[in-house]
Amino acid sequence: EPPTACREKQYLINSQCCSLCQPGQKLVSDCTEFTETECLPCSESEFLDTWNRETRCHQHKYCDPNLGLQVQQKGTSETDTICTCEEGLHCTSESCESCVPHRSCLPGFGVKQIATGVSDTICEPCPVGFFSNVSSAFEKCRPWTSCETKDLVVQQAGTNKTDVVCGPQDRQR
């Protein structure tokens, strides 16, 4: 009776179970009643990352420096190349096919999370008591100056974009 299902790392063809090719190898010919599956290693700069019955290996990704890409992990016969972005840039997608500059947080916003090669800057509005007067990809919201600790009084209230202005206490009562 021919099998209807095969074991792990096997596949069903012509009513029989053949061994899959191991990662890093492609299928040349299916097994027969008398012969084993024939597999061949992937060529240099190609890969297959699973047990498979593929007749062609996949090409390694190219981390094109002209697109701001650099290699994070070199490709092998079993794994694809992993790209990341040069400093100051981050990937436009999960597959990291190109890079764009990190965005800056505008005045009134501070950096919540600094960008990496794979993620952009995350900004947050400065809450009451904090401000940012610069456009920056690194600076967090800074606390308003405490006039009291300097024995001064607030002459001008702070905003999310400006610090408070301190001045001397009015001694005339």
Partner: antibody
Framework: EVQLVESGGGLVKPGGSLRLSCAAS????????MHWVRQAPGKGLEWVAY????????YYADTVKGRFTISRDNAKNSLYLQMNSLRAEDTAVYYC????????????WGQGTLVTVSS | DIVMTQSPDSLAVSLGEKVTINCKSS????????????LTWHQQKPGQPPKLLIY???TRESGVPDRFSGSGSGTDFTLTISSLQAEDVAVYYC?????????FGGGTKVEIK
């Protein structure tokens, strides 16, 4: 027997150009990635550039980017390194080395060719 | 770039004695897809080009005597010569084969005492 033979080295003035060649024999050249690696006199090894078996992928060290160009001619079993805007610090023995598709390591090296940049 | 730091810079050992060379990488050389550490060792004898000795941290290249062995993972690696022979006098280099730019350690010169 695998053989890699470099040529084209010599004395060149700063700012000058030189083209190195690496003739491969004893294996199917078009199946292998190729590297250039250099070694300054009395110093260690420094990777220079890589080109994949099918010419599709090329990477350079930052120290040579924009000045050096790696290329290959699979029909002629040859690897090349075009070196422009040469500097004194490029003085070294230049080796070609092959990379196979299994180990992904430099498994054979040539004997090297000496490049001297001096006025 | 990954920085490869070798120690010692040089050592002199008696014939038949054990040699241990250390190599430290500034970041992990573990390929997450196949779980292999892409650390390579090359041997360079005086006046000769380098020769592949060990790849994937511990796999000896064909024809390399079994007195040579490699170990380690992540960022810390070791090359051991179990019993030094006269023909082992050379400079040994560890190499990052994990990512570009490929980088080498500064080399360890092994001499006979």
């Amino acid at each position: 027997e695998v053989q890699l033979v470099e040529s084209g080295g010599g004395l060149v003035k700063p700012g000058g150009s030189l083209r190195l060649s690496c003739a491969a024999s004893g294996f199917t050249f078009s199946d292998y990635g190729m590297h250039w690696v250099r070694q300054a006199p009395g110093k260690g090894l420094e990777w220079v550039a890589y080109i994949s078996s099918g010419n599709r992928i090329i990477y350079y060290a930052d120290t040579v980017k924009g000045r050096f160009t790696i290329s290959r001619d699979n029909a002629k079993n040859s690897l090349y390194l075009q070196m422009n805007s040469l500097r004194a610090e490029d003085t070294a023995v230049y080796y070609c080395a092959r990379q196979d598709g299994y180990r992904y390591a430099m498994d054979y090296w040539g004997q090297g060719t000496l490049v001297t940049v001096s006025s | 770039d990954i920085v490869m730091t070798q120690s010692p810079d040089s050592l002199a050992v008696s014939l038949g004695e054990k040699v241990t060379i250390n190599c430290k990488s500034s970041q992990s050389l573990l390929n997450s897809g196949n779980q292999k550490n892409y650390l390579t060792w090359h041997q360079q004898k005086p006046g000769q080009p380098p020769k592949l000795l060990i790849y994937w941290t511990s796999t000896r290249e064909s024809g390399v005597p079994d007195r040579f062995s490699g170990s380690g993972s992540g960022t810390d690696f070791t090359l051991t010569i179990s019993s030094l022979q006269a023909e082992d006098v050379a400079v040994y280099y560890c190499q990052n084969d994990y990512t570009y730019p490929l980088t080498f350690g500064g080399g360890t010169k092994v001499e006979i005492k």
